[in-house]
């Protein structure tokens, strides 16, 4: 047991934020500026991610953790760890190779990113269109046309809410 302990790697004692410096008799040296080690026992420190150009710093690099980037205003992150920035568009638009374009009739986008999606087809659920769709908003489906026959109420009252775990009376 004592023999095992004496053969233990001296580098394992170096904490996060340091590296085991082979040039200085394997003593623990602090990570140089703009580098970090997030775990103990490291033989080198890693260079920090640099948030540059379209990227902006969300979290500064420290001796124990890497920098984190996000995108400058007008752009949003794509990819693992925000490896890319995609241009924002307005609601009612989608991003194409030629920039932001309005959604075609019959489609909508309620976000600054993503693609225009088709309006819901109410008739597939046997319902009618209560509120028309726009470039920014989906249609709102209402009761089925049969429910709107003369003498029928045009608005169905909501069913009473049930508390979770309770069976109906």
């Amino acid at each position: 047991f004592e023999r095992t302990r004496s053969l233990q790697d001296p580098c394992s004692n170096c904490p996060a934020g340091t590296f085991c410096d082979n040039n200085r008799n394997q003593i623990c040296s602090p990570c140089p500026p703009n580098s970090f080690s997030s775990a103990g026992g490291q033989r080198t420190c890693d260079i920090c991610r640099q948030c540059k150009g379209v990227f902006r710093t969300r979290k500064e690099c420290s001796s124990t953790s890497n920098a984190e980037c996000d995108c400058t205003p007008g752009f949003h992150c794509l990819g693992a760890g925000c490896s890319m920035c995609e241009q924002d568009c307005k609601q009612g638009q989608e991003l194409t190779k030629k920039g932001c374009k309005d959604c075609c009739f019959g489609t909508f986008n309620d976000q600054k990113r993503g693609i225009c999606r088709p309006w819901t087809n109410c008739s597939l659920d046997g319902k009618s269109v209560l509120v028309n769709g726009t470039k920014e908003r989906d249609v709102v489906c209402g009761p089925s046309p049969a429910d709107l026959s003369p003498g029928a109420s045009s608005v169905t009252p909501p069913a009473p809410a049930r508390e979770p775990g309770h069976s109906p009376q």
Partner: antibody
Amino acid sequence: EVQLVESGGGLVQPGGSLRLSCAASGFSLSTSGVGVGWIRQAPGKGLEWLALIDWADDKYYSPSLKSRLTISRDNSKNTLYLQLNSLRAEDTAVYYCARGGSDAVLGDWFAYWGQGTLVTVSS
Amino acid sequence: DIQLTQSPSSLSASVGDRVTITCRASQGIGSYLAWYQQKPGKAPKLLIYDASNLETGVPSRFSGSGSGTDFTLTISSLQPEDFATYYCQQGYSIWTFGQGTKVEIK
């Protein structure tokens, strides 16, 4: 259509300075998110990144050349510049201007390049 | 600086061959890697960005993979116009390029 056209290359004496220009069209150097930089290639060698300036006027330089480089731009002319001082024979290269990112998606790559301008440092 | 090491430095291949070029980073760089093609006397052309995204207009025979330290550019079926030099480039910290891989006709 994005275009980058470099100029200012030619024969320069060792110890001298040069100022390269890159005229951009099809986009504005001051558009949010845009970064444009300089990359060089010595005859028969690989690519070496030199400097980049972004729309917010943040500047980035190669550490090994930082003391001799100045990157700048003139928004009114939509033109990028590179000043390189204390020229040496090893600075002989084709100097390219390149724009960071692609069209709708931006990042740390170069989608648009100029044709390059040759700088020869010799006495 | 983060170093990028490409292998092989050069290779000979025939039309129709599957060609693989590797790029190894001196430390983890996530997916912040691009690949370029360069022909003599011409500027480099972007092929792949963010390790695996094909640039618009680039033929689908080109593909990229990898993350962290090891990356690969694959040409599934080499065409006559693909004989060129290929470079990888990282943008994780300041920009650096690999030394290049020349693809020659066998």
